[in-house]
């Protein structure tokens, strides 16, 4: 059900930190904001759900990482990559990116100055 979380590599690296956190609440939070009218997303019903559940857990998870621009950017890139295939059109991709870049601010963190969210070989 869950990944094996072992001590591999440099434990202070952003990659290690991003791997340790649960980014699903962040993904759900953003999808809810851009797809709130749709009935289902994944196996979870987001139609009647307050976004604050996901946001609280999302912010808690992002807070677990060192609050550096690079680590925050890597987390946002990972979220983008995870959700890329679910975004149906260009407009949705742009909406998702907009919400994603607002995420650190919603959690009262510093937003990364430069963060390239073009992932998955340019598809997103």
């Amino acid at each position: 059900m869950r990944r094996e979380r072992g001590r591999q590599g440099d434990s202070s690296s952003c990659e290690r930190q991003v791997d340790r956190v649960n980014l699903k609440p962040c993904e759900q939070h953003i999808m809810q904001r851009i797809m709130g009218e749709q009935e289902q997303y994944d196996s979870y019903d987001i139609r009647s759900t307050r976004s604050s559940d996901q946001q609280q857990r999302c912010c808690d998870e992002l807070n677990e990482m060192e609050n550096t621009q690079r680590c925050m950017c890597e987390a946002l890139q990972q979220i983008m990559e995870n959700q890329c295939d679910r975004l149906q059109d260009r407009q949705m991709v742009q909406q998702f990116k907009r919400e994603l870049m607002n995420l650190p601010q919603q959690c009262n963190f510093r937003a990364p100055q430069r963060c390239d969210l073009d992932v998955s070989g340019g598809r997103c």
């Epitope: 869950r2 649960n22 699903k24 994944d42």
Partner: antibody, heavy 123, light 108 residues
Framework: EVQLVESGGGLVKPGGSLRLSCAAS????????MNWVRQAPGKGLEWVSS????????YYADSVKGRFTISRDNAKNSLHLQMNSLRDADTAVYYC????????????????WGNGTTVIVSS | EIVLTQSPGTLSLSPGERATLSCRAS???????LVWYQQKPGQAPRLLMY???TRATGIPDRFSGSGSGTDFTLTISRLEPEDFAVYYC?????????FGQGTKLEIK
């Protein structure tokens, strides 16, 4: 074997203090959020407090806010609950519980529990 | 604070029967953050279901979970003697992470 063992319970007078501990073994303690949950005699479960992996985020139930302090020592694989200004209503079995999440879908759950330590607040 | 209300308080059934336990939230809860636990006398709680409908490791398929928003259900299709216990729902999306008051499933 994955295990949580609570200690530090006992009899204390109202207004007194007690420090509970939870020793973790069989897993990488620093990779998990941890919780304290209590159960008063003959009553249901009551979530008390949670602490994230790095201790950066901490939450408390309203009933214990300002009186209880949760902490952890990742180097020693231990979780603590400092309980001050104890009241009769704090009498309960206190469980330490590990919180994990499903990596593919995201939900959180408490999958490993200790057997509990009993706290009795009485004059 | 999200209040979870479980019903019925006590459910008296016989082995082989179907049990339906309800958990109602005072505010909408994401399925992602709804968990069910089982507790037997003198024992620590045991994880049963998470994400409202996913069975935990080792939980038999006679247990199933469903629901969304404010109404969630735990169903045991055919009761076995070892299923008689107290069942709790919990939401863990928004602090404080509240539990329902429990439903006691007893042998009729």
């Amino acid at each position: 074997e994955v295990q949580l063992v609570e200690s530090g319970g006992g009899l204390v007078k109202p207004g007194g203090s007690l420090r509970l501990s939870c020793a973790a073994s069989g897993f990488i303690f620093s990779d998990y959020n941890m919780n304290w949950v209590r159960q008063a005699p003959g009553k249901g479960l009551e979530w008390v407090s949670s602490i994230t992996r790095s201790s950066r985020t901490i939450y408390y139930a309203d009933s214990v806010k300002g009186r209880f302090t949760i902490s952890r020592d990742n180097a020693k694989n231990s979780l603590h609950l400092q309980m001050n200004s104890l009241r009769d209503a704090d009498t309960a079995v206190y469980y330490c519980a590990r919180e994990d999440f499903d990596v593919s879908t995201g939900p959180y759950y408490m999958d490993v529990w200790g057997n509990g330590t009993t706290v009795i607040v009485s004059s | 604070e999200i209040v979870l209300t479980q019903s019925p308080g006590t459910l008296s059934l016989s082995p082989g029967e179907r049990a339906t336990l309800s958990c109602r939230a005072s505010q909408s809860v994401s399925n992602m953050f709804l968990v069910w636990y089982q507790q037997k006398p003198g024992q620590a709680p045991r994880l049963l279901m998470y994400g409202a409908s996913t069975r935990a490791t080792g939980i038999p398929d006679r247990f199933s979970g469903s629901g969304s928003g404010t109404d969630f259900t735990l169903t045991i299709s055919r009761l076995e003697p070892e299923d008689f216990a107290v069942y709790y729902c919990q939401q863990n999306g928004n602090s404080p992470y509240t539990f329902g008051q429990g439903t006691k499933l007893e042998i009729k």
